[in-house]
Amino acid sequence: IWELKKDVYVVELDWYPDAPGEMVVLTCDTPEEDGITWTLDQSSEVLGSGKTLTIQVKEFGDAGQYTCHKGGEVLSHSLLLLHKKEDGIWSTDILKDQKEPKNKTFLRCEAKNYSGRFTCWWLTTISTDLTFSVKSSRGSSDPQGVTCGAATLSAERVRGDNKEYEYSVECQEDSACPAAEESLPIEVMVDAVHKLKYENYTSSFFIRDIIKPDPPKNLQLKPLKNSRQVEVSWEYPDTWSTPHSYFSLTFCVQVQGKSKREKKDRVFTDKTSATVICRKNASISVRAQDRYYSSSWSEWASVPCS
Amino acid sequence: RAVPGGSSPAWTQCQQLSQKLCTLAWSAHPLVGHMDLREEGDEETTNDVPHIQCGDGCDPQGLRDNSQFCLQRIHQGLIFYEKLLGSDIFTGEPSLLPDSPVGQLHASLLGLSQLLQPEGHHWETQQIPSLSPSQPWQRLLLRFKILRSLQAFVAVAARVFAHGAATLSP
């Protein structure tokens, strides 16, 4: 058993049929010595008396809010949560496996630049009695500070018969050094509590590996005289690190016809303009990627090719 | 050229070669995200690798103030990786494919280090840790880790030279 936060405790249980469970001793936080009784949740059934209560925690029915009273007055609470371990593996029932970029990916994180600011998100089908708490640091043995905000519900989607909820959190490295080569990864830890179930999820990454620039901005077309060629121009996204002579992007320009079957023409360039051929009903799209490190491409910025 | 005396490097040449290094490093080990090498207990490799750190003056302001500190750090790293790529880790079994970009990568590391420090000038270099994995699978894993680490190193070096070519060239 360990303390998650004040008056909230996590009991780690090996979860299998007829498991013995864990013996837990609860102590009433009071200077009083006698006349103390214990109850669980809203029940008025007295579970025991005395300053301490010893219980055998085997299942979710044994978890919950234990309260010690004296003469009708509440003295203190202890909330017991369960953390299940099945076949040596901690349960991951609360969050959905996003399977990207690999299986058992519960947390996904992205950064728009090298400023040390990043966003993580996760998915669940659970809609109520759910809380998250997020902590982060740079490195684990001698951790350097990363400050995370509160996790918030950022999107709701219908997936077949189920509703899916996306939560996200923003974090900022306290003393970020955008130009340095990272040697210690960022660690992100998410505590998830659903009713009386506790789970924790972690992710470890370098900012450079989760970079995904915003799409190029101000995408414009300038037709060339007596030609179906156009000069496409764009600008670096506002959110990208500066100066651009140092934090450079490379770009992919694509001409895509109306039908997905039509062949795509693609041009790669380090410049912020390119000359391409417009086809009927085509659109021109541009996306960006760090020029020197192959992290994710941005989403496409698109304009119709007319 | 970046020499201990403090003259400027051939920024544009360095920019071109460092960008080529980035391309080669990624073609030598293109897998991103498929194999989380940090799960494989790699402290003995990466702890000894010379990283370009915050105080090394490789940021735009530091380069403007005095690019020598940064260039020396980059030079150390280039020599370090050049020696690693020429070591038994890469020359031993399992043999690299004949068309592997590692050979070109090795040559380009040497080329860039020579651009930064011509014959007759010496910056101190870092000792190469003795990494001699016994099993071919360990050697393969170590190659991946070294290449991942090299990708990060050359990315910073390429940014430095791109910025230098754009803002510090005479």
Epitope: L224, N226, S306 | -
Partner: antibody
């Protein structure tokens, strides 16, 4: 910039015929080329085109009857099995724009070559 | 697509104005992929107007084009004897196979 059609002659129905348009002064890798015909005393009919990248398009009535192909300096129109209805002057015309759409304006035009199909 | 030209023939007096209409059975590509041609007997057609209203190089300014979508007009203001010819419109569409010429309008100058 010039175009000249050749290959027009008198043929019997069903005898395959290939017309050739020879171009000079511009590159077929940057221009779309069209074939148009005109029956005696009648209007213009667009047959089909080959675009700068080698893609072809045909009028719905012409599909299966005509095939357009090109080399670096020539554009061919093959008439698979001519009928008397195919008697006409055949023109080749360049797309006006560099990298023109099919259906863009045609300019310049060749002088035309006459095909007569008769038994 | 079917392009219908009206009227035909049309007679004009020197110095007068001639208006030829071209109606398309479907909207041309981007509302303006329509061109006009002049053809004299024994000659290939000559481009006059492209993109519905842009005058081709070397074409006298008495020729003008207008219209959008499915309805287009070629106007000859201050007709001259040399303008006696047959005029054709050509439409381009989303589907390349729909490319087609109008039936032609013969202009007779009296």
């Amino acid at each position: 910039q010039s175009l000249e059609e050749s290959g027009g002659r008198l043929v019997t129905p069903g005898t395959p015929l290939t017309l050739t348009c020879t171009v000079s002064g511009f590159s077929l890798s940057t221009y779309t080329m069209n074939w148009v015909r005109q029956s005696p005393g009648k209007g213009l009919e667009w047959i089909g085109a080959i675009s700068y990248d080698g893609g072809t398009a045909y009028a719905n009535w012409a599909k299966g009857r005509f095939t357009i192909s090109k080399t670096s300096t020539t554009v061919d129109l093959q008439i698979a099995s001519p009928t008397t209805e195919d008697t006409a002057t055949y023109f080749c015309a360049r797309g006006f724009y560099v990298y023109a759409y099919i259906g863009d304006a045609f300019d310049p035009w060749g002088p035309g070559t006459l095909v007569t199909v008769s038994s | 697509a079917v392009l219908t030209q009206t009227p035909s023939p049309v007679s004009a007096t020197v110095g007068g104005t001639v208006t030829i209409k071209c109606q398309s059975s479907q909207t041309v590509y981007k509302n303006n992929l329509l061109s006009w041609y002049q053809q004299k007997p024994g000659q290939p057609p000559k481009l006059l107007i492209y993109l519905a209203s842009t005058l081709a190089s070397g074409v006298p300014s008495r020729f003008s084009g207008s219209g959008s979508g499915t309805q287009f007009t070629l106007t000859i203001s201050g007709v001259q004897c040399d303008d006696a010819a047959t005029y054709y419109c050509l439409g381009g569409y989303d589907d390349d196979a729909d490319t087609a010429f109008g039936g032609g309008t013969e202009v007779v100058v009296v």
